[in-house]
Structures are given as C-alpha cells and as structure tokens.
C-alpha cells in the first residue's frame, strides 16, 4: 500500500483526495552507483538472443524518452554465429511507472501510468505442443 | 522535455517551484492489455540463463514492492540440462522511476528517484582477455 501515518512536517493534503493526489518533486535523485559495470555492458550485442534498441518518444509522458528492445532474431545465435531456430529469442518485459500529463498539455498535473517495456532479450526453449 | 504550456483547465502551480513540483494522481492507469501472455510467461524457467525472482520491499517507496531477478548460474544451460561455463548468464538491468517519500513518512509528498533493477537474465559470450 502507499499510505503512511501523517507527520506534522508534511505538506497538507485535503482528505477528500487523500492519498490519491500527491505532490511530487521532479528533481530526480539517482540511487545508482556512479559507475555500474553491468549497466555499461554490451550485452545487447554479445547475447545469444541479441537485440536492438529503439528510442520511443512521447512528449505527454515523463520521462518523454524510453529506449525499447527488439530481438534481432526469432531463434538464438549459436557459437558458430548461425541462428538456431530450435530455440527462441524472446523479449524480457518489465512493467514500469511513468507520469502521463492529465489533463493533456498541463505542465504540472500528471497521472501515474503503468506501461510495459521490453528491456532486452533472452533465449528460451520453445514450448512444444504434441498432437495426440 | 518535461513541461507543457499552461492550460486554463490545469491545476495551479506556484511559479517558484514550477515545473519542479507537480501534482500526481496515484489512481494508476494501466496501458497494458489485461492479460499479457509474455509477461505471465515462464521465461525465467525456460531460459538458457534462468533466474529467480526476489521480493524487494520498501515502505518509503512507491511502488513499495519490486521483484528483482538473480541469475541461477554463472554459465548457461545447454540442451542436455548441464551448465556450459564457456558462456555467462548475466542480469539485464533497467533504470526505472519510483516515488520516494520526502520528507520521510509523509503520505502525500514524494520525490522522483531513479533506481536500477535486474529484470531477467540473458546468455552472453564472455569477453576473453588475451595475455600478451
């Protein structure tokens, strides 16, 4: 849940909205360590299920830019560089929170929105349906 | 960019904070289709780089629960079920936005925060460092 006991040092909220409409400071705090070797990797190229990244832009959304992964192949890349179609490259999807302007074009009013983004790809064994 | 022209139908914002502090409606709108087969998949088990999911909980954060992936093996699973240590299972990480209560414990005041989460794993060819 999201509601927490009120504290005298907190901004007021009208109870009729509480806690549905909140104040959010957009000065982003970055919790990530300054240099994260895992993030600065080239997994997208080195994976057996490689992917390309596409810049998805939406000025009515915050953040307005999201990078989306698209798997390069239906199958997975073997050690010899050829694609094995007995395996499948599939996108790993993540549900993320974004802010959507509501009403549209308002600079300071948003609604939380859940969207599904493809973060990268993984190689899976296909589900084989046997015919009786 | 983040801010959009003020519209007479928009809530007011004090110019000193504009557009850093905004109003956000927490009634989440879900853009995802109600049942997404890819999301409700068992890729974490069927992948050549399988992973387990761990529940990360923080009541001062919204959402308070985030599931984090941890790769099961250092190597990748072969067709025969054995692990190939000539390949590496690695986490795919995604930078996501969450809301952090600020001041702490306040029910209706948040700050945006960027955090890095592991969404799943992929199988990659290792980088081989040759000694001269």
């Amino acid at each position: 849940g999201i509601a927490i006991p009120r504290n005298s040092g907190c901004p007021n909220s009208e109870d009729k909205n509480f806690p549905r409409t909140v104040m959010v400071n957009l000065n982003i705090h970055n919790r990530n360590t300054s240099t994260n070797p895992k993030r600065s990797s080239d997994y997208y190229n080195r994976s057996t299920s490689p992917w390309n990244l596409h810049r998805n832009e939406d000025p009515e959304r915050y953040p307005s830019v999201i990078w989306e992964a698209k798997c390069r192949h239906l199958g997975c890349v073997k050690a010899d560089g050829n694609v094995d179609y007995h395996m499948n490259s599939v996108p790993i999807q993540q549900e993320i929170l974004v802010l959507r302007r509501e009403p549209r074009h308002c600079p300071n009013s948003f609604r939380l929105e859940k969207i599904l983004v493809s973060v990268g790809c993984t190689c899976v064994t296909p589900i084989v349906h046997h015919v009786a | 960019g983040i801010a959009i022209p003020r519209n007479s139908g928009c809530p007011n914002s004090e110019d000193k904070n504009f557009p850093r502090t905004v109003m956000v409606n927490l009634n989440i709108h879900n853009r995802n289709t109600s049942t997404n087969p890819k999301r409700s998949s068992d890729y974490y088990n069927r992948s050549t780089s399988p992973w387990n999911l761990h529940r990360n909980e923080d009541p001062e954060r919204y959402p308070s629960v985030i599931w984090e992936a941890k790769c099961r093996h250092l190597g990748c699973v072969k067709a025969d079920g054995n692990v190939d240590y000539h390949m590496n299972s690695v986490p795919i990480q995604q930078e996501i936005l969450v809301l952090r209560r600020e001041p702490r414990h306040c029910p209706n005041s948040f700050r945006l925060e960027k955090i890095l989460v592991s969404v799943g794993c992929t199988c990659v060819t290792p980088i081989v460092h040759h000694v001269a």
């Epitope: 810049r55 307005s64 600079p107 | 960019g1 983040i2 959009i4 022209p5 557009p19």
Partner: antibody, heavy 119, light 107 residues
Framework: EVQLVQSGAEVKKPGASVKVSCKAS????????FHWVRQAPGQGLEWIGV????????AYNQNFRDRATLTADKSTSTAYMELSSLRSEDTAVYYC????????????WGQGTLVTVSS | NIVMTQSPATLSVSPGERATLSCKAS??????VGWFQQKPGQSPRLLIY???NRYTGVPARFSGSGSGTDFTLTISSLQPEDFAVYFC?????????FGQGTKLEIK
C-alpha cells in the same frame, strides 16, 4: 568537471568518409545520451542524431539516416560520428553534446570539429 | 519537422539597455524550448531550458518566457560580453530543431 573533447579538424575529398570523436570525462559516460549537431559556415544548427552509450541505442534525423553512423566505446568513454559519401555541403563544424534525458536539455557541448569537404 | 523561426535576424542595442529576442515554433512545443548563446569560434552555451528556467551559473539578467508556439529571451541590461548570436531550440520531438539565430550587436 564535465568535459567533452573532440578530435581535430579534417579535410576530405567528395565521396570520402570522416569519423569525428568526442571523449567524455567528469561523469559516468553510460548515464546520458550523446547527440550530434552540425553548423555550416554562417548557418544555424542541424541535429544529426543520438546514441545512448549505456544501451547502444541510436536514432537519426531522417536527412542523415543513410550516411551517418553513431557509435560509442565505453572502455574509453568516447562517442563517434561517422559521415560517409561526403559532399561539399557537408562542410561544417560538428558538435557532440550531452543530453539529459529526464530533464530534457543539452547541457555540455564539445568544442566542435571543422570538417571541410573540397576537391 | 518543427520549424523554429527567430526574429529579428540582427538586433542592435546599446550596452545597459534591454534586449528582447523572439522565437516562434511552427506547432506547439509546450515549453520544451532552450536558448543558447554562441560567440565566434565557440560552441553553444545553454542559458535557458524549459522556456523559463535559468541554467546553473547563468546571470539573472537573462530570462525566458513563453509556451506553445511563442517564446522570448530577454536580457534586462546588456553587458559587453552579451553581444553574440542567440539560438532557440526545441526538444519536444525529434528531429530536434534550432532557430536560425539572432545576432545581437552593439549599437
């Protein structure tokens, strides 16, 4: 201190290719997008495209899609812009600039690289 | 593509006076507009972002305003170092575009 240092001036013949580098320091290279912008002599600024060094993603201005290639080398914190099939109208100063994706603005710029295309 | 049109092309103002530069977008770009200063042989320097926010270290005499399609950069009291070319730029949607520039010269 954040710094973007670009490679030196280049003189190329029409039809040739040029590769301009931009070395970043003073921050985590993979955290921000890199955009490339050019400025022809006495003209305005024209956006070429963007690369995200953290994930390898690229996007291009349609006008440059077939000729420009953006790459990044994380080991040296260097971004590259290669332009092929050069013509005289490509004579310009080429800039790299850091873009804050969430905040939405270009904050730091390289010093610029003059590319002259002449037969 | 969104076209950013600046006016005037050249503006002659005396030091100590006020300068007002205009930028019009061919369609609404919200307030996703930045202003840059460029001196000969130098790279652009960010002054204003999101139409009205002064970037770190920029003197208070620089201010920006506007939303939608009409934007203004105002320099309240011109200093000798302010004479340069000024560009507006939109990052509302790619391809990101710039105005052709306004040259601010000493009268």
């Amino acid at each position: 201190e954040v710094q973007l240092v670009q490679s030196g001036a280049e003189v190329k013949k029409p039809g040739a290719s040029v590769k301009v580098s931009c070395k970043a320091s003073g921050y985590t290279f993979t955290d921000y997008e890199f955009h490339w912008v050019r400025q022809a002599p006495g003209q305005g600024l024209e956006w070429i495209g963007v690369i995200h060094p953290g994930n390898g993603g690229t996007a291009y201005n349609q006008n440059f899609r077939d000729r420009a290639t953006l790459t990044a080398d994380k080991s040296t914190s260097t971004a590259y812009m290669e332009l092929s099939s050069l013509r005289s109208e490509d004579t310009a100063v080429y800039y790299c600039t850091r873009f804050l994706t969430y905040e939405g603005y270009f904050d730091y710029w390289g010093q610029g690289t003059l590319v002259t295309v002449s037969s | 593509n969104i076209v950013m049109t600046q006016s005037p092309a050249t503006l002659s103002v005396s030091p100590g006076e006020r300068a007002t530069l205009s930028c019009k977008a061919s369609q609404s770009v919200s307030i996703d507009v930045g202003w840059f200063q460029q001196k000969p042989g130098q790279s652009p320097r960010l002054l204003i972002y999101h139409a009205s926010n002064r970037y770190t270290g920029v003197p208070a005499r620089f201010s920006g305003s506007g939303s939608g399609t009409d934007f203004t950069l105002t320099i309240s009291s011109l200093q000798p170092e302010d004479f340069a070319v000024y560009f507006c730029q939109q990052d509302y949607s790619s391809p990101y575009t710039f105005g052709q520039g306004t040259k601010l010269e000493i009268k």
